[in-house]
Interface confidence: low
Amino acid sequence: LPLKEEEILPEPGSETPTVASEALAELLHGALLRRGPEMGYLPGSDRDPTLATPPAGQTLAVPSLPRATEPGTGPLTTAVTPNGVRGAGPTAPELLTPPPGTTAPPPPSPASPGPPLGPEGGEEETTTTIITTTTVTTTVTSPVLCNNNISEGEGYVESPDLGSPVSRTLGLLDCTYSIHVYPGYGIEIQVQTLNLSQEEELLVLAGGGSPGLAPRLLANSSMLGEGQVLRSPTNRLLLHFQSPRVPRGGGFRIHYQAYLLSCGFPPRPAHGDVSVTDLHPGGTATFHCDSGYQLQGEETLICLNGTRPSWNGETPSCMASCGGTIHNATLGRIVSPEPGGAVGPNLTCRWVIEAAEGRRLHLHFERVSLDEDNDRLMVRSGGSPLSPVIYDSDMDDVPERGLISDAQSLYVELLSETPANPLLLSLRFEAFEEDRCFAPFLAHGNVTTTDPEYRPGALATFSCLPGYALEPPGPPNAIECVDPTEPHWNDTEPACKAMCGGELSEPAGVVLSPDWPQSYSPGQDCVWGVHVQEEKRILLQVEILNVREGDMLTLFDGDGPSARVLAQLRGPQPRRRLLSSGPDLTLQFQAPPGPPNPGLGQGFVLHFKEVPRNDTCPELPPPEWGWRTASHGDLIRGTVLTYQCEPGYELLGSDILTCQWDLSWSAAPPACQKIMTCADPGEIANGHRTASDAGFPVGSHVQYRCLPGYSLEGAAMLTCYSRDTGTPKWSDRVPKCALKYEPCLNPGVPENGYQTLYKHHYQAGESLRFFCYEGFELIGEVTITCVPGHPSQWTSQPPLCKVTQTTDPSRQLEGGN
């Protein structure tokens, strides 16, 4: 971009650094100092006043940092005047055309649309801008600018090309790339290449989205790696690259793209729940309360667009009401209000529960914690303060089986006068017909029954949802409706509790924090053991992890807390997955005693599932009509499989497979195929054969013939037959060709020579070879053959051995014609 000098270099003092840029300078300064003096970065007392101005309309000003060219000299600055830069190097205009510091990518594909890049509806048009500010601080050179504007939702940032002759004269390079996208979007970067030398530094900072908001360091070179993804939760990101001399590394290439920011997941109100349609702008969060609680505040919140999207109001709360009348009651709950607050320390709450005519009420005491001296709970069978008392906390123990009204109403009165201990009350009511038992209830569990009407004789069996256990544990986990005259259950309902620790050996399940979904209490040390079948691993999915500061969940990769630590999880955490290396996983949750922090510490929900080990080669089926043996029980690297076939079957493929380092098999698994051919019967000596089929399949023939002078002994034709078991077989043995002529007599040994093998008779077709002693040469045929006939004859006379006439050694042993 050919800009004028005045557009880049401001008048001295004309720019005042913003709070954000001051903070950036401090942050960069601190981060670079941490690298230590061996990198050539030293603390300095002054800040370089040089400010590189971004293009018109932009306000980002990033001060450069103190630098020293050699230890102990203090910071050197470059004086700036309105007319240019003093120094012995090239003048500024020669440096204004930058090397390609940033490049725009190809147009984004429809598969991954970026944010809108033009005005939409009534929105003001904005652009995505990269401001790259470079300050080069030496005694002899001018600042190098590597800036480029980008108006795309994604692109690349690359280190400057420093191969030019001008660049090689530079002493120190200092670039700040500022990526700016729409409000409501954040910036995600992926490191594609990163090859920096030790002296180079690359910092990634989440820029202040608005003036006065300080940038935050996301990563430095030592924390970055190729393939790594970082997200800035603001619409501004800064990349700060420094090199004290001409870079020796291969530089960097970083891909960036805008992503739509979202509202945080709204907190679940105590004693209630929240459901969210979408966390992005426009999405809604709807709140509702548990039975016995009323919603205080807005039922629905909307996620509003903005630099940081946020909900349009405060999270509502669920408050218990102090008294009231419940008409036509069927099923519900009454709970004590929180002490203090609107109701004050003293409470007098009166509830009237009225069921329909012909029905009675069962009141189940779910949670009761009353201060003996200051709290009192009374329940009356009837609808008035004068009805007969059936429970008085000052006189009676908490009824395990609950209370049953004689009439269709219950009157509940709670009195509390400045209790020393927190008040807790949760009563569950349910209306039922008079001639049957009330419907049993099990929070976090299932009730199965032999009679859904719960008439006398009905059995109700209890079981808990995954992650919960029956309390009291063990049998009986069933109760019976007894006594037709006055039906009632013969035992109390159990409770399902998220326990502190336990042994889990299901293929899949849940680990819950103690007392989930209630907050866990302080002073916990729980250990869970998760065990799946051997040869498997455990995939653990952290669904919810929201524990108090100081509390910790430790995952051990094995059986017991002495195993290797897989992860230590604290504080609120996003969803994540973890994988054990073997079939055992131990979880330990520690929450030290002490007063709980109000409003914090929901707990945790962890799902687990057994999965195949992925450090083994894939399972291979055993061959049909054969078997295989393995060198190891599990198919780990180096395992050798040896394949064999049953009789009558042949192996197609390699008989040995090895599990390789990349967890693939060295070859495809072989197969055992029924053998449908006879073995090659072979040729015969002194004869030849003709076959009806070269592969010798069942039904094919082989015919044998002998050479002249030989006669066939055996079957001339063989047929290949199949058999029920084993391999196919030939109908006969292979015949032989027998000589039908008399032999040749040994012609004798030449004088001064010898034969290879001395025999009296040689059969037709046999050959005889002659040699001469040293100093003699062979005259005639070296080899003669017995030709069949009547009589059989040698092909020629035996040779002679004569004294050698020459010194040629090649003629001493053998001769030719």
Partner: antibody
């Protein structure tokens, strides 16, 4: 090759039960969860639950709790879906689907069994 | 439970055109999303898992992207055999595992 072969179509009356089978071949049956997914005529897919063929452990969608039973016979590499108290809206194609082994998605599906519930 | 909403319900395109199918989750499911193709009278077939990984034997013209709540299945150039109904499925939270309502890709 890996395949799941399901039993043939069934016609049932409301209130009755149906048992669908799914025979696995070409892989180790006990090493992977088996899921059941149904699809009403002209509708989308609905997950019913899974069975661990190794242990017989199950996990059912809340909607089918109390009406569905998933079992298996490892001697013949077969999984079964039993749905009781049939209603007309249970008319659907019932698919068995092999778990991927790493996460809860399905890499092999049976061809489906049409169950028609009609009075 | 997590609700998946697919759009559009029907997509009318010609062979050779590019198809872009959307799936939106009611809450953040990271990248735990699978895509399936179902032809009339056939069982579904796995195309994509973990939002962007192609299943074995699936042609390169099928690609998946997205994370969090918004996901996209792209068919770069439609072949005649690609016309079918496509379903997304979240494999993040269970039970239950849930599917989208489906997008029908038909020949224009």
């Amino acid at each position: 090759q890996v395949q799941l072969v399901q039993s043939g179509a069934e016609v049932k009356k409301p209130g009755a039960s149906v048992k669908v089978s799914c025979k696995a071949s070409g892989y180790t049956f006990t090493a992977y969860y088996m899921h059941w997914v149904r699809q009403a005529p002209g509708q989308g897919l609905e997950w019913m639950g899974w069975i661990n063929p190794n242990s017989g452990g199950t996990n059912y969608a809340q909607k089918f709790q109390g009406r569905v039973t998933m079992t298996r016979d490892t001697s013949i590499d077969t999984a079964y879906l039993d749905l009781s108290r049939l209603r007309s809206d249970d008319t659907a194609v019932y698919y068995c689907a092999k778990d991927s082994g790493y996460d809860w998605y399905f890499d092999i599906w049976g061809r489906g069994t049409l169950v028609t519930v009609s009075s | 439970e997590i609700v998946l909403t697919q759009s559009p319900a029907t997509l009318s395109l010609s062979p050779g055109e590019r198809a872009t199918l959307s799936c939106r989750a009611s809450q953040n499911i990271s990248s735990y999303l699978a895509w399936y193709q179902q032809k009339p009278g056939q069982a579904p077939r796995l195309l994509i898992y973990d939002a962007s990984n192609r299943a074995t034997g699936i042609p390169a013209r099928f690609s998946g992207s997205g994370s969090g709540t918004d996901f996209t299945l792209t068919i770069s150039s439609l072949e005649p055999e690609d016309f079918a109904v496509f379903y997304c499925q979240q494999h993040s939270n269970w039970p239950p595992l849930t599917f989208g309502g489906g997008t029908k890709v038909e020949i224009k």
